[in-house]
């Protein structure tokens, strides 16, 4: 996502299932730290940030040219698993040891 | 990077090598389209932006809380290379037929 | 400083019944998972089965479904595992230990053991 | 019998480099993921590895883990006489975690 001032970064973000309304299928846990992608993509793009050759173009194309394009943005590059107990189609309490996707693991410039 | 009011697609952004400084070792082409990834990425995420669960449960945080996470962001999320005749480190004109992750393929929100 | 404490070595006869403990502290042990490992002597860890204090939502082992029953006092901090009727084969050493965070997979903390003996 | 294989016992000198496997299948190892534990003689296991190839902290980098399809393996670089214990590869499979049936580490000499 979008971001202030700071460089491209994984910041905390406490996600309660309540919440988004994942309750009512999630019986645990409550909560858990999807973490969040934030802060900018300035030039130069740093290698923290692995940027693509094209991440690397459009952040020279908006250096030259700000208002015809926009930075690259800093997003989730690499997402980890959570485990959950969740109500399967029987509505029978089953525990995924690893529901992917979860949980961002690196941020990156694309 | 982030757009407008419309949802997340595929534009063309022409850049020109001249522009970004690579005609120093990128003889051709003059310029490609790179295309950029624009538009917003709005509740309810469509199938057609490929979300992960991470960018769901972000977009449904951001729906509950809009100051607290912002939205998923638009970017490629596949590449493809182009092909370029550059200056290798003699100098020598050689030809790259596929010079990868130059030109978005694809775009998503994530 | 994260901790699991079990409860003291038991020896008992065939056909009696048995409860032991784990007490976990630093850190909150609503919302992690504690899951149930044996060691019989001289050999390999067996996984027991697992359970998640916050609602005493359990799974079990195929091989252990029916055996024993894994429970929590989440006002004490304790889990346990019991048998209603133990068999000699019961004999083993008997760990807890806590699933990582967000993988209930990986167990990152463990106690120092009970050791149970089943002998007539 | 268990659910994951490992060899029964491997040996290496002090600074060698010794690899412990682990052969399952398409429904445990094959489809999830792998953690290692060391379990030195009269103590309680300790994790080594989670998530096929993640280190706890605390953890030297001399171990490593990798998976390929339906097998994985433990690299211990540089062995030392402290590293002289059993180890045990686990998965999931469906609900159920499963253990390999352990692996001793001699260091030789």
């Known amino acids: 996502s979008t971001g202030a001032s700071s460089h491209c970064q994984k910041t905390s973000l406490r996600v309660n299932f309540e919440d988004i309304g994942w309750d009512s299928w999630i019986i645990a846990p409550k909560e858990y730290d999807a973490y969040e992608c934030k802060g900018g993509c300035f030039f130069p793009l740093a290698d923290d940030v692995t940027p693509t050759k094209h991440a690397i173009v459009q952040t020279l194309v908006h250096l030259k040219f700000p208002t015809k394009v926009g930075k690259a943005c800093c997003v989730p590059t690499k997402l980890s698993p959570i485990s959950i107990l969740y109500k399967d189609d029987m509505g029978v309490p089953t525990l995924k040891y690893h529901y992917e996707g979860m949980s961002v693991a690196e941020c990156g410039c694309r | 990077s982030t757009g407008a009011s419309s949802h997340c697609q595929k534009t063309s952004l022409r850049v020109n090598f001249e522009d970004i400084g690579w005609d120093s070792w990128i003889i051709a082409p003059k310029e490609y389209d790179a295309y950029e990834c624009k538009g917003g990425c709005f509740f309810p995420l469509a199938d057609d932006v490929t979300p992960t669960k991470h960018a769901i449960v972000q977009t449904l945080v951001h729906l509950k809380f809009p100051t607290k996470v912002g939205k998923a962001c638009c970017v490629p999320t596949k590449l493809s290379p182009i092909s370029i005749l550059y200056k290798d480190d003699m100098g020598v004109p050689t030809l790259k037929y596929h010079y990868e992750g130059m030109s978005v393929a694809e775009c998503g929100c994530r | 400083e994260v901790q699991l404490v079990q409860s003291g070595a038991e020896v008992k006869k065939p056909g009696e019944s048995l409860k032991i403990s784990c007490k976990g502290s630093g850190y909150s042990f609503t919302t992690y998972w504690i899951g149930w490992v044996r060691q019989m002597p001289g050999k390999g860890l067996e996984w027991m089965g697992i359970i998640y204090p916050e609602g005493s939502y359990t799974t079990y082992s195929p091989s252990f479904q029916g055996q024993v029953t894994i429970s929590a006092d989440k006002s004490i901090s304790t889990a346990y595992l019991q048998w209603s009727s133990l068999k000699a084969s019961d004999t083993a050493m008997y760990y807890c230990?806590?699933?990582?965070?967000?993988?209930?997979?990986?167990?990152?903390?463990w106690g120092q053991g009970t050791l149970v003996t089943v002998s007539s | 019998q268990s659910v994951l294989t490992q060899p029964p016992s491997v040996s290496g000198a002090p600074g060698q480099r010794v690899t412990i496997s682990c052969s399952g299948s398409?429904?445990?190892?094959?489809?999830?993921?792998v953690s290692w534990y060391q379990q030195l003689p009269g103590t309680a296991p300790k994790l080594l590895i989670y998530r096929n190839n993640k280190r706890p902290s605390g953890v030297p980098d001399r171990f490593s883990g990798s998976k390929s399809g339906t097998s994985a393996s433990l690299a211990i670089t540089g062995l030392q006489a402290e590293d002289e214990a059993d180890y045990y590869c686990s998965s999931t499979d469906k609900e159920h975690l499963v253990f390999g049936g352990g692996t001793k580490l001699t260091v030789l000499g």
């Open positions: 398409s429904s445990n190892i094959g489809d999830n993921y």
């Open positions: 230990a806590r699933g990582k965070r967000v993988d209930a997979s990986s167990f990152d903390y």
